[in-house]
């Protein structure tokens, strides 16, 4: 029972995590314009892995995709790759773990096969979570580096008279979604690996012992006890908190003047 609960919980946590990784990857707010200590602009810039957006105070939002592969920074390409690998591994892990769930009966699948599948999916979730955390962390590091570089020359003087304000970017909501989602996927993967230990049948072969009593003989053949692990004994006290980050990807397409009419 505890094994089933641990496996089920691991699956659900991983599912939430992978959904979060997908959401983070698709979100436009990986980096957002830093408003602190900056002149207040009537334009707000934010960027994602796939496109950059500008929201005017008018409410109009324009998003432009990065329609180049070669022109993009290597770091951005690496982050994209890490996030995609994380999603692919997570999706395969979910598929495998569905069939591995103890509560689901598929033909006459052995417990050992389910245990192997649970372990496989667990490892996939762990790697998926690590990919997401790594991707988000690389991007965050890139932002921090650029932030301090742009702070060093925040105002690039032009002839000493005219000033150009450099737009600085800070952490966007997607980074936090990514970190939380990666962490959840990692936790889910660990739970699956723990559940795998409980699923694996431990063959304990005792030699058959014959007891000869007067009048009749009884043979006891104790065999193949399934070792019960103590995991999940206090699961009812565990609370799983989901960050519940909402993605507001409300990209308003440019209205024509007729939108007023």
């Amino acid at each position: 029972m505890a094994v089933t609960a641990c496996q089920g919980l691991g699956f659900v946590v991983s599912l939430i995590g992978i959904a979060g990784i997908i959401a983070a990857t698709c979100m436009d707010q990986w980096s957002t314009q830093d408003l602190y200590n900056n002149p207040v602009t009537a334009v707000f810039n934010y960027q994602g892995l796939w496109r950059s957006c500008v929201r005017e105070s008018s409410g109009f939002t324009e998003c432009r995709g990065y329609f180049t592969l070669l022109g993009l920074p290597a770091m951005l390409q690496a982050v994209r790759a890490l996030m995609i690998v994380g999603i692919v591994l997570g999706a395969i892990g979910l598929l495998v773990s569905i069939f591995a769930l103890k509560c689901i009966r598929i033909g006459s699948m052995e417990d050992s096969a389910k245990a192997n599948m649970t372990l496989t999916s667990g490892i996939m979730f762990i790697v998926s979570g690590l990919c997401a955390i790594a991707g988000v962390s690389v991007f965050a590091n890139m932002l921090v580096t650029n932030f301090w570089m742009s702070t060093a020359n925040m105002y690039t003087g032009m002839g000493g008279m005219v000033q150009t304000v450099q737009t600085r970017y800070t952490f966007g909501a997607a980074l936090f979604v990514g970190w939380v989602a990666g962490g959840l996927t990692l936790i889910g993967g660990v739970m699956m690996c723990i559940a795998c230990r409980g699923l694996a049948p431990e063959e304990t072969n005792y030699k058959a012992v014959s007891y000869h009593a007067s009048g009749h003989s009884v043979a006891y053949k104790p065999g193949g006890f399934k070792a019960s692990t103590g995991f999940g004994s206090n699961t009812k006290n565990k609370k799983i908190y989901d960050g519940g980050a909402r993605t507001e990807d409300e990209v308003q397409s440019y209205p024509s003047k007729h939108d007023y009419v």
């Epitope: 002149p39 207040v40 005017e56 409410g59 150009t164 939108d259």
Partner: antibody, heavy 118, light 113 residues
């Protein structure tokens, strides 16, 4: 057709307050920010501030903070600007205008002349 | 606040003539996010509210004759009227739409000779 109908001219005494209205029609009122602009004796234009009719959020020109208060009534699609502690310096034509691409102002009210005189 | 400097303050022209007026801002109005300049040009005739001519420094508003052209980037902007018509006689204002508070230039008065 988009229309911004402003209230009529106002003659006020110094120290008094005045509330100018701007009734919008022909478009979704809550979809676009409403801006207010002042023009003194036919000279240049001064941006007072703007209000998001949907959330009620405002941005003010520091110069007009404490002088102008922007509000909206969504039910009647009307924007209001209240000017308090009027002085002769506040005598001007006040325009309301809706925002467009590039934060530009596309549709303007006809203007409300406020005269402050003892 | 961003200072918008328009020059000349007035222009006396003859019909059919080409006219250029300048607008300079104290800070760059170019947004790096979309490479657009947040500068707007308006035309105001006596007793009327201003009329939007050009936004994003060079995008002509629909219905505005193509004799009106906006150019420039960063801090230096120009409005050109290729062939002035009698109905173009008005005051022309440029506006900073990038930094709060949104500020206007003092205007360029276009008069007929």
């Amino acid at each position: 057709e988009v229309q911004l109908q402003q209230s009529g001219p106002e003659l006020e005494k110094p120290g008094a307050s005045v509330k100018i209205s701007c009734k919008a029609s022909g478009y979704s009122f809550t979809a676009y920010n409403m801006n207010w602009v002042r023009q003194r004796n036919g000279k240049s234009l001064e941006w007072i501030g703007n209000i998001d009719p949907y959330y009620g959020g405002t941005n003010y020109n520091q110069k007009f903070k404490g002088k102008a208060t922007l509000t909206v009534d969504k039910s009647s699609s009307t924007a209001y600007m209240q000017l308090k502690s009027l002085t002769s310096e506040d005598s001007a034509v006040y325009f309301c205008a809706t925002v467009y691409y590039g934060n530009s102002l596309i549709y303007w009210g006809q203007g409300t002349l406020v005269t402050v005189s003892a | 606040d961003i200072v918008m400097t328009q020059s000349p303050s007035s222009l006396t022209v003859t019909a059919g003539e080409k006219v250029t007026m300048s607008c300079k801002s104290s800070q760059s109005l170019l947004n790096s996010g979309n490479q657009k300049n947040y500068l707007t040009w308006y035309q105001q005739k006596p007793g009327q509210p201003p009329k939007l001519l050009i936004y994003w420094a060079s995008t002509r508003e629909s219905g505005v004759p193509d004799r009106f052209t906006g150019t420039g980037s960063g801090t230096d902007f120009t409005l050109t009227i290729s062939s002035v018509q009698a109905e173009d006689l008005a005051v022309y204002y440029c506006q900073n739409n990038y930094f709060y508070p949104l500020t206007f230039g003092a205007g360029t008065q276009l008069e007929l000779k």
